[in-house]
């Protein structure tokens, strides 16, 4: 078909054509997190704004209860940024005393829950050691990649420590996905 | 329509079909920045290469005067990376003297300007404290997400300190957007 | 065509329509790296998993011998994350002695090889100084942008030090591309 003018009568396509404006899409933005119980050995999930400001969901992509719900099977680009901020970690004090130590860390995981596998699947992980000396610190972790998802799959963002997440601005911490 | 051969006579689509090669797209790359006056309390905007090397604009997406001009309404993926480099910050010297201090920082903001709205909107922000001891330092900040933009919107990249931007290579600092 | 119902008889399109599910796409995930000889002054390339777990290639996008092979010309979004981890760098010891020093660093480069051009082209680079005091450290570098690629182009990911790459989990270090 390369370079050929569109002619419906002889066009051969191997999959149904699709109007781009009709594809499931979402961009969610940070809100203040309410402390919730989470399972031991499992990072807590963030909850999100899905309507106000820059946030939106469209074309059957729904947000509910910390999850983005995938409404149709296909390849999706999934992304998130979490900005963390904190005070000097204990690790830095130990370091100042000259004793090496396993550093404190910050971690973001984009997780998929699916009905075809009993355990949540970690799609993306960004993890960083934090060993700051004598100061407040702040930094983002960004993640994004393409995944084959199934109708009914659920996506969430988990973090190592919810109290370190910067929830002050919608442009600092966000989560999104769109069907390619 | 799933699994069904393309048959124009009975295809039902909820939005007009669109050839992908016809969508507005741009990838801009860094150039040496000329010092310019910028408003107090407002981060300066970077200007960009839009034609040479890896840089391009296409399908009515235009670059002019530090701005990417959105030629049609829709959902766009917008991204940028800025690589910063600098000498030891003052903060580290203060820290060495044992006094905690609000750290120096580096910040990138992707900003949208809309004629119908008086204030620029910050779409994406990456901000990081920098407290390096006794050395030159360098590091990138990457941002990317999807936004619903309107025809006539203008996008720019602002940074906290233009003198810290690494303009030496087109692959280190860049800015792009494409209609989904 | 805006807002107009799909009517094949009068639709005007400037490029052939294309079913999204038919586009070349790949997401590759990290595997343990086998030490290989690489040219002096050239960063070594990573090799990847292309079938198991989250990894896939589809629609004529093939992976072979560390390269993603571009099967058709067009605009692609290309991305990678590499998570590095290491022990205290020498740099930190020098710093502790109070002598400023060019810091150790970690670098990721997404490189394009084109048969018709003798030199590889660096599409994206993420480079970061690492000067950690008295601890193990770990951190990701993420890259992603859009490029106009030609059929037959080959993409690879190069790193400054293959021994520092975290190959333990498919969600930490990955590489992908998809036709827009």
């Amino acid at each position: 078909l390369k370079g050929q003018e569109f002619a419906p009568s002889h066009q051969q396509v191997y999959a149904p054509l699709r109007a781009d404006g009709d594809k499931p899409r979402a961009h969610l933005t940070v809100v203040r997190q309410t402390p919730t119980q989470h399972l031991k050995n499992q990072f807590p999930a963030l909850h999100w704004e899905h309507e106000l400001g820059l946030a939106f969901t469209k074309n059957r992509m729904n947000y509910t209860n910390k999850f983005l719900l995938i409404p149709e099977s296909g390849d999706y680009f999934v992304y998130s940024q979490v900005t963390f901020r904190g005070m000097t970690s204990e690790c830095s004090e130990i370091r100042q005393a000259g004793r090496p130590n396993k550093p404190d860390s910050i971690t973001v995981v984009i997780t998929k829950v699916t009905d075809s596998y009993p355990e949540p699947t970690q799609l993306l992980m960004g993890t960083k050691s934090v060993c700051e000396v004598g100061s407040n610190w702040f930094q983002p972790i960004y993640l994004g990649a393409m995944f084959s998802l199934q109708e009914g799959d659920k996506l969430m963002v988990n973090v190592s420590d919810i109290s370190l997440v910067d929830y002050t601005k919608e442009d600092k911490t966000f989560f999104g996905a769109f069907l390619l | 329509l799933k699994g069904q051969e393309f048959a124009p006579s009975h295809q039902q689509v909820y939005a007009p079909l669109r050839a992908d090669g016809d969508k507005p797209r741009a990838h801009l790359t860094v150039v040496r920045q000329t010092p310019t006056q910028h408003l107090k309390n407002q981060f300066p905007a970077l200007h960009w290469e839009h034609e040479l090397g890896l840089a391009f604009t296409k399908n009515r997406m235009n670059y002019t005067n530090k701005f990417l001009l959105i030629p049609e309404s829709g959902d766009y993926f917008v991204y940028s990376q800025v690589t910063f480099r600098g000498m030891t910050s003052e903060c580290s010297e203060i820290r060495q003297a044992g006094r905690p201090n609000k750290p120096d920082s580096i910040t990138v903001v992707i900003t949208k300007v809309t004629d119908s709205y008086p204030e620029p909107t910050q779409l994406l922000m990456g901000t990081k404290s920098v407290c390096e001891v006794g050395s030159n330092w360098f590091q990138p900040i990457y941002l990317g997400a999807m936004f619903s933009l309107q025809e006539g919107d203008k996008l720019m990249v602002n940074v906290s300190d233009i003198s810290l931007v690494d303009y030496t290579k087109e692959d280190k600092t860049f800015f792009g957007a494409f209609l989904l | 065509l805006k807002g107009q119902e799909f009517a094949p008889s009068h639709q005007q399109v400037y490029a052939p329509l294309r079913a999204d599910g038919d586009k070349p796409r790949a997401h590759l995930t990290v595997v343990r790296q086998t030490p290989t000889q690489h040219l002096k002054n050239q960063f070594p390339a990573l090799h990847w998993e292309h079938e198991l777990g989250l990894a896939f290639t589809k629609n004529r996008m093939n992976y072979t011998n560390k390269f993603l092979l571009i099967p058709e010309s067009g605009d692609y979004f290309v991305y990678s994350q590499v998570t590095f981890r290491g022990m205290t760098s020498e740099c930190s010891e020098i710093r502790q002695a109070g002598r400023p020093n060019k810091p150790d660093s970690i670098t990721v480069v997404i490189t394009k090889v084109t048969d018709s051009y003798p030199e590889p082209t660096q599409l994206l680079m993420g480079t970061k100084s690492v000067c950690e005091v008295g601890s193990n450290w770990f951190q990701p570098i993420y890259l992603g942008a859009m490029f106009s690629l030609q059929e037959g182009d080959k993409l690879m990911v190069n790193v400054s030090d293959i021994s520092l790459v975290d190959y333990t989990k498919e969600d930490k270090t990955f590489f992908g591309a998809f036709l827009l």
Epitope: T64, N65, P71, V113, D115, S116, Y117, P118, G152 | - | -
Partner: antibody
Framework: QVQLQESGPGLVRPSQTLSLTCTVS????????MHWVRQRPGRGLEWMGR????????KYNPSLKSRVTITRDTSKNQVSLRLSSVTAADTAVYYC?????????WGQGSLVTVSS | DIQMTQSPSSLSASVGDRVTITCRAS?????MYWYQQKPGKAPKLLIY???NLASGVPSRFSGSGSGTDFTFTISSLQPEDIATYYC?????????FGQGTKVEIK
């Protein structure tokens, strides 16, 4: 404590509709998936279908699709199964099952007999 | 449908014996699940993802395999292991179980 409790009539007349309810407690149903599996006397296990409670997406066993409906009421923490036009071959123990997080959890099962 | 063919349909072994059950899928699957069902009880997940042991399950149970051929093993049969064991695939629609293997003590 995570629990699933099936309830409904133990006897259904042929050609009628079998209706069962699964009431869950001890977890957030919306973050999981809820399935119905049945076991006919002396037979193996047969998956009937599932619902994703947050959005209501359903998948059914094609062999039962024309007769089976699974719904949910998240406010009541309940999932329901309806199987229409039953015959004696639908006599079975019906299990409600949670997936989407380890361990998967099964109800104790509800025996339904189809007989006139 | 993906058919699951489990063998043997029943077996009798002594306490301490190694017991192996196989399951063959009619087409390739990524993951296999193994359940234990005791009389009058609901099935209990033992193995997920072909080889992962579910929480609280004794280490004498194990699973292996990929593609179409999967194996479930009890390394040292215990009296409490008397049950029927089922394999299951979760990928194709419908989800399908093997017909079961009844394990008895000699």
């Amino acid at each position: 404590q995570v629990q699933l409790q099936e309830s409904g009539p133990g006897l259904v007349r042929p050609s009628q509709t079998l209706s069962l309810t699964c009431t869950v407690s001890g977890f957030d149903m919306q973050s999981t998936y809820m399935h119905w599996v049945r076991q006919r006397p002396g037979r193996g296990l047969e998956w009937m279908g599932r619902i994703e409670p947050a959005g209501g997406h359903t998948k059914y066993n094609p062999s039962l699709k024309s007769r089976v409906t699974i719904t949910r009421d998240t406010s009541k923490n309940q999932v329901s199964l309806r199987l229409s036009s039953v015959t004696a071959a639908d006599t079975a123990v019906y299990y409600c099952v949670r997936s989407g997080g380890l361990p998967d959890v099964w109800g104790q099962g509800s025996l339904v007999t189809v007989s006139s | 449908d993906i058919q699951m063919t489990q063998s043997p349909s029943s077996l009798s072994a002594s306490v301490g014996d190694r017991v192996t059950i196989t399951c063959r899928a009619s087409s390739s699957v990524s993951y296999m699940y193994w359940y234990q069902q005791k009389p009058g009880k609901a099935p209990k997940l033992l193995i997920y993802g072909a080889s992962n042991l579910a929480s609280g399950v004794p280490s004498r149970f194990s699973g292996s395999g990929s593609g179409t051929d999967f194996t479930f093993t009890i390394s040292s049969l215990q009296p409490e292991d008397i049950a029927t064991y089922y394999c299951q695939q979760w990928e194709g629609n419908p989800r399908t179980f093997g017909q079961g293997t009844k394990v008895e003590i000699k």
